[in-house]
Amino acid sequence: SGTTNTVAAYNLTWKSTNFKTILEWEPKPVNQVYTVQISTKSGDWKSKCFYTTDTECDLTDEIVKDVKQTYLARVFSYPAGNVESTGSAGEPLYENSPEFTPYLETNLGQPTIQSFEQVGTKVNVTVEDERTLVRRNNTFLSLRDVFGKDLIYTLYYWKSSSSGKKTAKTNTNEFLIDVDKGENYCFSVQAVIPSRTVNRKSTDSPVECMGQEKGEFREI
């Protein structure tokens, strides 16, 4: 149902990385505009992206209020230039999104190795603690602040001269690993949320190797 010149949105999809969260949908509008509403299961609907010709809406500001809540969005379709017009049932056409729980579903962004420091036969590798748009007491929380020990980093490391890899893990942002003296090593890290069943792992970080800019070597 609805007016003859509007079509309902479809393929409503959540795109979310490190809590930056955008709702996308189809189709590209022809003579129509969209408004998005978002709500928690028990809350009131809040309108966003009023009368837009875009097919996406940034809902980050809403979901970061409580990342453990489950959210539902809906996309309303209106005739362009006549947004008061409604469908035959007396309200505009709309389509519901799938439910979305940010804490469980946001993708983990590609991590970055912040630094590594060699002291004798030990190397300390530090992973950058990425800032999210989640706020507490007016400050932005890092990924570690949000997930705590529910966030693990896996380190892959190998001698530059060989292909055999080793791995280590940490539920902080630092690794302390043993290395052979006089050998250069390369490093890559991956983030993991062990408690999840989907979207558990990030992509690997860019590879960083000793003897390049990021590291520091100290002979003890």
């Epitope: 693990i152 896996t154 890899k165 280590a168 893990k169 062990p194 069943t197 989907v198 558990r200």
Partner: antibody
Framework: QVQLVESGGGVVQPGRSLRLSCKAS????????MHWVRQAPGKGLEWIGL????????IYDPKFQGRFTISADNSKNTLFLQMDSLRPEDTAVYYC??????????WGQGTPVTVSS | DIQMTQSPSSLSASVGDRVTITCKAS??????LNWYQQKPGKAPKLLIY???SLADGVPSRFSGSGSGTDYTFTISSLQPEDIATYYC?????????FGQGTKLEIT
């Protein structure tokens, strides 16, 4: 429900090769790290190595590096262990296991391999 | 590589006894230690993870403690169904290593 089923074990002559499979159901292997562990008759558990099926990263105990190869076919949701140049001391039950990063939460039932002439 | 020294290799105890098994790592494994129970012909079963956390569905008579290099597994009151071999596993860094195992028998 989550299940891991190993297959491909059997009797093989020393020096020959064998390929074990581990078919997963109830989850996608690419979402987890996957491991192979073995246990010789009357002996303890021995870790062989792991794979991240999503990117193909593999890690081995150095004693198996070069002779054993772990791979995965994500489209078939199956893990493999290719064992070359087999020796009598490789006789064991071979298990695959799923790793949630804090623990191995699911194991297969094991597949026995006997290396004997 | 990290070595795990598990002791004792076997022990005999009575129903209701308190049983303790230890694992010592050759270096700090930062609590990345699990305890598994294995019965003959079966795959290992997770009991304790991250040194002290009880796995889902595992009876509360099982517990774990420790940090750094020294870890302890305890059965507070031994039951007949606890007859099995118990293994520790460190997974903080590769190669992952198991303890040698402790075979538990009832007297």
């Amino acid at each position: 429900q989550v299940q891991l089923v190993e297959s491909g074990g059997g009797v093989v002559q020393p020096g020959r090769s064998l390929r074990l499979s581990c078919k997963a159901s109830g989850f996608n292997i690419k979402d987890y790290y996957m491991h192979w562990v073995r246990q010789a008759p009357g002996k303890g558990l021995e870790w062989i190595g792991l794979i991240d099926p999503e990117n193909g990263n593999t890690i081995y105990d150095p004693k198996f590096q070069g002779r054993f190869t772990i791979s995965a076919d994500n489209s078939k949701n199956t893990l493999f262990l290719q064992m070359d140049s087999l020796r009598p001391e490789d006789t064991a039950v071979y298990y695959c296991a799923r790793d949630n990063s804090y623990y191995f939460d699911y194991w297969g039932q094991g597949t026995p391999v006997t290396v004997s002439s | 590589d990290i070595q795990m020294t598990q002791s004792p290799s076997s022990l005999s105890a009575s129903v209701g006894d308190r049983v303790t098994i230890t694992c010592k790592a050759s270096q700090d494994i930062r609590k990345y230690l699990n305890w598994y129970q294995q019965k003959p012909g079966k795959a290992p079963k997770l009991l304790i993870y991250y040194a002290t956390s009880l796995a889902d569905g595992v009876p509360s008579r099982f517990s774990g403690s420790g940090s750094g290099t020294d870890y302890t597994f305890t059965i507070s009151s031994l039951q007949p169904e606890d007859i099995a071999t118990y293994y520790c596993l460190q997974h903080g860094e590769s190669p992952y290593t198991f303890g040698q195992g402790t075979k538990l028998e009832i007297t």
